[in-house]
Amino acid sequence: EDELQVIQPEKSVSVAAGESATLRCAMTSLIPVGPIMWFRGAGAGRELIYNQKEGHFPRVTTVSELTKRNNLDFSISISNITPADAGTYYCVKFRKGSPDDVEFKSGAGTELSVRAKPS
């Protein structure tokens, strides 16, 4: 039985250039203890999009909403979207480790597509 589920409810999101994109992520537990991070892409070349604990991410804000009793909200919003932001975004739970945290579970991903800015 899964001890924690990472839920990215939207497979895809389409946003007009210049607008903000909301990427949803919920988890069923805080356990195992460890940070939650957002990445664009998968594998070794993935790009860190947000880590609350460290780093500077001026375009990213957290958008926690009142969720169900049994879910924890780790959604983000990225402002001023450009075509360069297109890609698949993953919400990833890490487990605290020594010396380094270990990736525990990833959401299924949300593909962000960028529409041309309406003229």
Epitope: E1, L4, S29, L30, I31, P32, V33, Q52, R69, L72
Partner: antibody, heavy 118, light 112 residues
């Protein structure tokens, strides 16, 4: 109705051991993170141990780490706290608590008293 | 460790009036905009009972005269109007992703 019933408390000498048990009913035990919290008149409430729903991950504060071991048997809807090398400062009422998301302690048992004294 | 400081330690309020309890954390207990701060009520001879989870969410079955507010480091539990059965000790508790999880020292609420 959720029920958590602790047992196993008692009087033990310093350096001794005790095993506390918590019998759960009225909810899907295997889906819940489980914890022990203790209460002393002097120190108030203190988190003692937490175990993940499947039993893979356990967490302890430094005050009990290496002396206490938390385990669970989901087939028996039971939680166990093995307490070794007990000290006078471990004297407290020990509560079993359940947590759906591992954040708040949603339900508590009535507690079992542990007294460590020579 | 995150230290939770509750104030006041004790509080006497007239029936029907508002009781306000403060809990201040030594560092933020917020994760992704959610405050991992919770409030419990404990009556003599009984275990603690969850009232408010994640700063402001009323636990099922808890009367709506109880409310919670705050974020990051400053949190408040409000009972309005206070009723006789609310005489108890109230504790805040943080469960951020930094161990150990900790409790405040408690606030004893009495009737004036």
């Amino acid at each position: 109705e959720v029920q958590l019933v602790e047992s196993g408390g008692g009087l033990v000498k310093p350096g001794g051991s005790l095993r506390l048990s918590c019998a759960a009913s009225g909810f899907t035990f295997s889906s819940y993170v489980m914890s022990w919290v203790r209460q002393t008149p002097g120190k108030g409430l203190e988190w003692v141990a937490t175990i993940s729903s499947g039993g893979t991950y356990t967490y302890y504060p430094s005050s009990v780490k290496g002396r206490f071991t938390l385990s669970r048997d989901n087939a028996k809807n039971s939680l166990y706290l093995q307490m070794n090398s007990l000290r006078a400062e471990d004297t407290a009422v020990y509560y079993c608590a359940s947590s759906l998301t591992g954040s708040s302690f949603d339900y508590w048992g009535q507690g079992t008293t542990v007294t460590v004294s020579s | 460790d995150i230290v939770l400081t509750q104030s006041p330690a004790s509080l006497a309020v007239s029936l029907g009036e508002r009781a306000t309890i403060s809990c201040r954390a030594s560092e933020s207990v917020d994760l992704y905009g959610t405050s991992f701060m919770h409030w419990y009520q404990q009556k003599p001879g009984q275990p603690p009972k969850l009232l408010i989870y994640r700063a402001s969410n009323l636990e099922s079955g808890v009367p709506d005269r109880f409310s919670g507010s705050g974020s990051r480091t400053d949190f408040t539990l409000t009972i309005n109007p206070l009723q006789a059965e609310d005489v108890a000790t109230y504790y805040c508790h943080q469960s951020s992703d930094e161990l150990p999880w900790t409790f405040g020292g408690g606030t004893k609420v009495e009737i004036k």
